[in-house]
C-alpha cells in the first residue's frame, strides 16, 4: 500500500432523500465486484486518503429508460461529479447530460487531496439503475 | 514484465455465427495499433493471465448508423462485457445500450483472475464497425 | 519523473480559424485543474516526450446543445483524436460522432512515441463548451 496504489470501485446503494441530489455508494467484496483499497466511504460518499493525481470514472444508467424518457417527457437529467467537501475545495470535476440516451459514461484525470470527498449529483426525475454492471463509480491513484 | 504490467488493446476481427452474439477480437502490431502484452486471445476472446485489478475499457460503433437506425427502426442494440469462463465466475461486468446513439464507450475497474476469459456480447440487428478508431477493447492491469 | 509517469490533463482554450478543425488546448495549475507533467503543448496541440503505451481519454460537450441540435438541424458533428505529426505517423486513434447527443466521451490504449503530436479534430457547425468539467483531453503513460 505504501506505493500509493489507492483504488476504489463502488456500486450504487441508494439515492438521497427529496432535496438531496447525491447518489449514495457502497463497496466491498461481500457486495459483489466493488472494493475500497485506500479511499473510504463517509455516509455513502467517497473520501480520498492520499494526495495525488487520480483517474476518476463513472457510468450511470437510468432505470426503466428509453430514448423518449430522456428527451421530451422528462426534466433534463444531468450527472455531475465534484469535490463537495471541504467547502474550500468545492468544484465540479465532470458533468454530463443524458439528452436522448439512457447511459452516461466518462473519465478524467484530476488532482485530489487527502480529505477530499467526492459527490455524484444526479438531477432530473428518473432513477438510476442499481444493476452493478450498469451503474458504478471509481477512482484510481495514478501518480503523486 | 515481472511488475505485472499486463495490458492489451484489441481490434474487431469479426462477429460470431448466427446464434453467437460474441464479438471476436484480434491484436498485434502487424494489424495496426493493437497489441497483447500478457493477456492472450483464445479463439478471439481475451484471456487473463495474471490476477489483479484491471481497468477494462471498450468502444463499439455501429456500422452505417444514424440516430434513426438505433431508435425505432431496429431491434434494441446492447453491448455487454463479462467473464464468460470459467462458468463458475461467469458475470456481467459492463452493460450499455445504444438507444439513439451509434457509439457506446465506457470503462471500469474490476478484479480479474488468471484464466478468466472476457466476452463482449453485442445483441441487436446492426453490425459493429471494424474501423480501428471506432471499435476497440482493452484491459490494463493496475494493481494486485 | 524518471519512472516515466508522463501525464497531462488539458482544458479547451479555443477552436481553430475557419478551415482548421483542430481544438486548441491549454493546461496548468493557474488555469484550474489542468496540468502537464512530461508532455508539452505546441501551439495548443499535445506533444509526447516519452515513448510508451498511453491511455488517451477525451470528453467534448457541445455548447448550447439539445438533441435536436445534433440531429436534423446541423451538419453531422464528429470528433477524431489522432497523431497529426510527424506526417509519417499520421493516423486516427479515436473517432466518435455526436448523433442525437451533446457529449462524447471515450478512452483507449495506444502506443505513442516521443515527438508524436496529438490533434483533436471537431467537424460540424456546433461549438465545443469551454467549461472545464464538460470538455477535457488527457493522456497517461501506462507502460514502456
Amino acid at each position: 500500500e505504501s506505493l500509493g496504489w489507492d483504488i476504489a470501485e463502488l456500486q450504487l446503494n441508494h439515492t438521497g432523500p427529496q432535496q438531496d441530489p447525491r447518489l449514495y455508494w457502497q463497496g466491498g467484496p461481500a457486495l459483489g465486484r466493488s472494493f475500497l483499497r485506500g479511499p473510504e466511504l463517509d455516509k455513502g460518499q467517497l473520501r480520498i486518503r492520499r494526495d495525488g493525481i487520480y483517474m476518476v470514472h463513472i457510468q450511470v444508467t437510468l432505470a426503466i429508460c428509453s430514448s423518449t424518457s430522456t428527451s421530451r417527457h422528462h426534466h433534463p437529467t444531468t450527472l455531475a461529479v465534484g469535490i463537495c467537501s471541504p467547502a474550500s475545495r468545492s468544484i465540479s470535476l465532470l458533468r454530463l447530460s443524458f439528452h436522448q440516451g439512457c447511459t452516461i459514461a466518462s473519465q478524467r484525470l484530476t488532482p485530489l487531496a487527502r480529505g477530499d470527498t467526492l459527490c455524484t449529483n444526479l438531477t432530473g426525475t428518473l432513477l438510476p439503475s442499481r444493476n452493478t454492471d450498469e451503474t458504478f463509480f471509481g477512482v484510481q491513484w495514478v501518480r503523486p | 514484465e515481472s511488475l505485472g504490467w499486463d495490458i492489451a488493446e484489441l481490434q474487431l476481427n469479426h462477429t460470431g455465427p448466427q446464434q453467437d452474439p460474441r464479438l471476436y477480437w484480434q491484436g498485434g502490431p502487424a494489424l495496426g495499433r493493437s497489441f497483447l502484452r500478457g493477456p492472450e486471445l483464445d479463439k478471439g476472446q481475451l484471456r487473463i493471465r495474471r490476477d489483479g485489478i484491471y481497468m477494462v475499457h471498450i468502444q463499439v460503433t455501429l456500422a452505417i448508423c444514424s440516430s434513426t437506425s438505433t431508435s425505432r427502426h431496429h431491434h434494441p442494440t446492447t453491448l455487454a462485457v463479462g467473464i464468460c469462463s470459467p462458468a463458475s465466475r461467469s458475470i456481467s461486468l459492463l452493460r450499455l445500450s445504444f438507444h439513439q446513439g451509434c457509439t457506446i464507450a465506457s470503462q471500469r475497474l474490476t478484479p480479474l483472475a488468471r484464466g478468466d476469459t472476457l466476452c463482449t456480447n453485442l445483441t441487436g440487428t446492426l453490425l459493429p464497425s471494424r474501423n480501428t478508431d471506432e471499435t476497440f477493447f482493452g484491459v490494463q492491469w493496475v494493481r494486485p | 519523473e524518471s519512472l516515466g509517469w508522463d501525464i497531462a490533463e488539458l482544458q479547451l482554450n479555443h477552436t481553430g480559424p475557419q478551415q482548421d478543425p483542430r481544438l486548441y488546448w491549454q493546461g496548468g495549475p493557474a488555469l484550474g485543474r489542468s496540468f502537464l507533467r512530461g508532455p508539452e503543448l505546441d501551439k495548443g496541440q499535445l506533444r509526447i516526450r516519452r515513448d510508451g503505451i498511453y491511455m488517451v481519454h477525451i470528453q467534448v460537450t457541445l455548447a448550447i446543445c439539445s438533441s435536436t441540435s445534433t440531429s436534423r438541424h446541423h451538419h453531422p458533428t464528429t470528433l477524431a483524436v489522432g497523431i497529426c505529426s510527424p506526417a509519417s505517423r499520421s493516423i486516427s486513434l479515436l473517432r466518435l460522432s455526436f448523433h442525437q447527443g451533446c457529449t462524447i466521451a471515450s478512452q483507449r490504449l495506444t502506443p505513442l512515441a516521443r515527438g508524436d503530436t496529438l490533434c483533436t479534430n471537431l467537424t460540424g457547425t456546433l461549438l465545443p463548451s469551454r467549461n472545464t468539467d464538460e470538455t477535457f483531453f488527457g493522456v497517461q503513460w501506462v507502460r514502456p
Partner: antibody, heavy 119, light 111 residues
Framework: QVQLKQSGPGPVQPSQSLSITCTVS????????IHWVRQSPGKGLEWLGV???????DYNVALMSRLNITKDNSKSQVFFKMNSLQTDDTAIYYC?????????????WGQGTLVSVSA | DIVLTQSPASLAVSLGQRATISCRAS??????????LHWYQQKPGQPPKLLIY???NLESGVPARFSGSGSGTDFTLNIHPVEEEDAATYYC?????????FGAGTKLELK
C-alpha cells in the same frame, strides 16, 4: 425454418392497384424488417421498399408516391400495395429479409408473385 | 443512386475451369471496415439465392468453390472449379445506402 409465403394477383388492369401479402414464419416481425424487390425483363432487379420492426418505412424515391407497405405483427403478415400500375410495372414481386441483421442483403426470399399489367 | 456495372454480360466456361465475374460500383460501397457488396445466383423460375455477403463471406450451405473479393468500387466473383449446376445468372448487389441496387446480371453457360 424461416419462410416467406406470398399471395396475390396475377393480371392487373392499367391504372389499378396491386396488393400482395407476405406471410412469414419462424421469426417475428417485431424484430426484423421485410424488404420488397421486383424483377422485370426491362429493369432487372429493383429494390422497392422496406418496413422496419416499428412499422416505419423506407421507399425507393422513384416509386414512393405509389407505394404503401404495412403489416400486422400478430398475424405475421406484411402488406404491399402499389397504386396506378402501368405496363412497365409488369414484374415478379418478392418479399425478402436478412438472416440476422437489418442491412439489405437477402438470404430469405418469398417464392415471388407474378404481376402482369395489361389491358 | 449507386450504379453497379457487371461484366461480362455472359460467359461460357468449360466444366472444371474458372469463371470470373466483375462488378464495378459508381462510388465506393465500403464503410465501417466492410464492403457492402453481395452476390446472388438465379435460375429460371426461382428467386435469387444469396451466395456471398459483405464481399467475401460465404452464405451457409454455399459450396467453397464460390469466392468473392474486392473493396471500394471493384469486386469479383470467382467460381472454381465450375460445375454443371452453376449454369445460372449471377447478380451483384450493394447495401451501402438506400436504395440498394443490383447489377444487370451475368449469364454463365457451360461450354
Amino acid at each position: 425454418q424461416v419462410q416467406l409465403k406470398q399471395s396475390g394477383p396475377g393480371p392487373v388492369q392499367p391504372s389499378q392497384s396491386l396488393s400482395i401479402t407476405c406471410t412469414v414464419s419462424d421469426f417475428s416481425l417485431t424484430i426484423f424488417g421485410i424488404h420488397w424487390v421486383r424483377q422485370s425483363p426491362g429493369k432487372g432487379l429493383e429494390w422497392l421498399g422496406v418496413i422496419w420492426r416499428d412499422g416505419s418505412t423506407d421507399y425507393n424515391v422513384a416509386l414512393m408516391s405509389r407505394l404503401n407497405i404495412t403489416k400486422d405483427n400478430s398475424k405475421s403478415q406484411v402488406f404491399f400495395k402499389m397504386n396506378s400500375l402501368q405496363t412497365d410495372d409488369t414484374a415478379i414481386y418478392y418479399c425478402a429479409k436478412n438472416r440476422r441483421y437489418d442491412y439489405a442483403w437477402f438470404p430469405y426470399w418469398g417464392q415471388g408473385t407474378l404481376v402482369s399489367v395489361s389491358a | 443512386d449507386i450504379v453497379l456495372t457487371q461484366s461480362p454480360a455472359s460467359l461460357a466456361v468449360s466444366l472444371g475451369q474458372r469463371a470470373t465475374i466483375s462488378c464495378r460500383a459508381s462510388k465506393s460501397v465500403s464503410a465501417s471496415g466492410y464492403s457492402f457488396l453481395h452476390w446472388y445466383q438465379q435460375k429460371p423460375g426461382q428467386p435469387p439465392k444469396l451466395l456471398i455477403y459483405l464481399t467475401s463471406n460465404l452464405e451457409s450451405g454455399v459450396p467453397a468453390r464460390f469466392s468473392g473479393s474486392g473493396s471500394g468500387t471493384d469486386f469479383t466473383l470467382n467460381i472454381h472449379p465450375v460445375e454443371e449446376e452453376d449454369a445460372a445468372t449471377y447478380y451483384c448487389q450493394h447495401s451501402r445506402d438506400f436504395p440498394p441496387t443490383f447489377g444487370a446480371g451475368t449469364k454463365l453457360e457451360l461450354k
